[in-house]
Amino acid sequence: PRSIDVKYIGVKSAYVSYDVQKRTIYLNITNTLNITNNNYYSVEVENITAQVQFSKTVIGKARLNNITIIGPLDMKQIDYTVPTVIAEEMSYMYDFCTLISIKVHNIVLMMQVTVTTTYFGHSEQISQERYQYVDCGRNTTYQLGQSEYLNVLQPQQ
């Protein structure tokens, strides 16, 4: 068997809402993956599991099942959404994200994704993780790759 390539492209959109009573931020983050099947037979993308971390704390998880079948030597782009919650124990983040004196409220999130593919009863898992900028202050649509956090070192939060 040849490889199945998974490429995390980036954040496609981030939609934000607030609970002022709980001082909590809700971010619905839609991500884009490219999955390439280099084989001469079809493979099934069985599931995608994803999680988002902020400052080493998991703030959101998602799982998609029975997603798609990728034909021989084909590539599919898949969007998946992770609902995240920055809760009251990170109260300072509510202040930052709702601060009107700051115009771009970028926070650095670690996106982790695992894609499980199957073919002829064989299962394979491919994982990726990437740091991304997300604006927690307003709804934002990104051009693919625009939200990339380029610092190779783990950011200090």
Partner: antibody, heavy 119, light 112 residues
């Protein structure tokens, strides 16, 4: 209904001190940043202080830095402005205002309290 | 500091006709995120200021759609399509692109 009620305005001698208060009701006070804006006798508006919802971020213009201190007590739904080393140019109506993070500005203002600095 | 400039008085207008109030900033208020950080407030006689327009062209909640606003990065116009008696007061433009946030001197709407 959003309500902001300022109090504490008075006649003060130059060099004196005063503390203004603003009691908020009709909204979740702890979820909103707040500002103080003053209106001078010639009707000009001047922003003088901002405090974030949890008091993590505080901003002043250079003209009042070191003399004015903004604070808040979320348990009491109250915003404060402590003023010291007062000058005649601090004479104004002082308004407290709620910040709307969706609008990106102050959306509701109180009725104001008057400070007069004069000997 | 960003200086906001307004004429002290508008051209006198007749009730039911349209009025325009201008404001100019000393620096562009258009941010790289595409938002223009220009606001309009109305202070009616004996009252505190009330928000009319946020981020240059958006009507605040409860504001009649007789009000509209447009502009470039530095020149802005507030329009009232059919002036009513309750529109009388002083109109202030303001910016909060940069600290310190600053206001224009205000334009008093004059009725003929």
């Amino acid at each position: 209904e959003v309500q902001l009620v300022e109090s504490g305005g008075d006649l003060v001698k130059p060099g004196g001190s005063l503390k203004l208060s603003c009691v908020a009701s009709g909204f979740t006070f702890s979820g909103y940043g707040m500002s103080w804006v003053r209106q001078t006798p010639d009707k000009r508006l001047e922003w003088v202080a901002t405090i974030s919802s949890g008091s993590f971020y505080i901003y002043y213009p250079d003209s009042v830095k070191g003399r004015l201190t903004v604070s808040r007590d979320n348990a009491k739904n109250t915003l404060y402005l402590q003023m010291s080393s007062l000058k005649s140019e601090d004479t104004a109506i002082y308004y407290c205002a709620r910040q709307n993070f969706y609008y990106g500005c102050e959306d509701y203002w109180g009725q104001g309290t008057t400070l007069t600095v004069s000997s | 500091d960003i200086v906001m400039t307004q004429a002290a008085f508008s051209n006198p207008v007749t009730l039911g006709t349209s009025a325009s109030i201008s404001c100019r900033s000393s620096k562009s208020l258009l941010h790289s995120n595409g938002i223009t950080y220009l606001y309009w407030y109305l202070q009616k006689p004996g009252q505190s200021p009330q928000l009319l327009i946020y981020q240059m062209s958006n009507l605040a909640s409860g504001v009649p759609n007789r009000f509209s606003s447009s502009g470039s990065g530095t020149d802005f116009t507030l329009r009232i399509s059919r002036v009513e008696a309750e529109d009388v007061g002083v109109y202030y433009c303001a910016q909060n692109l940069e600290l310190p946030w600053t206001f224009g001197g205000g334009t008093k709407l004059e009725i003929k």
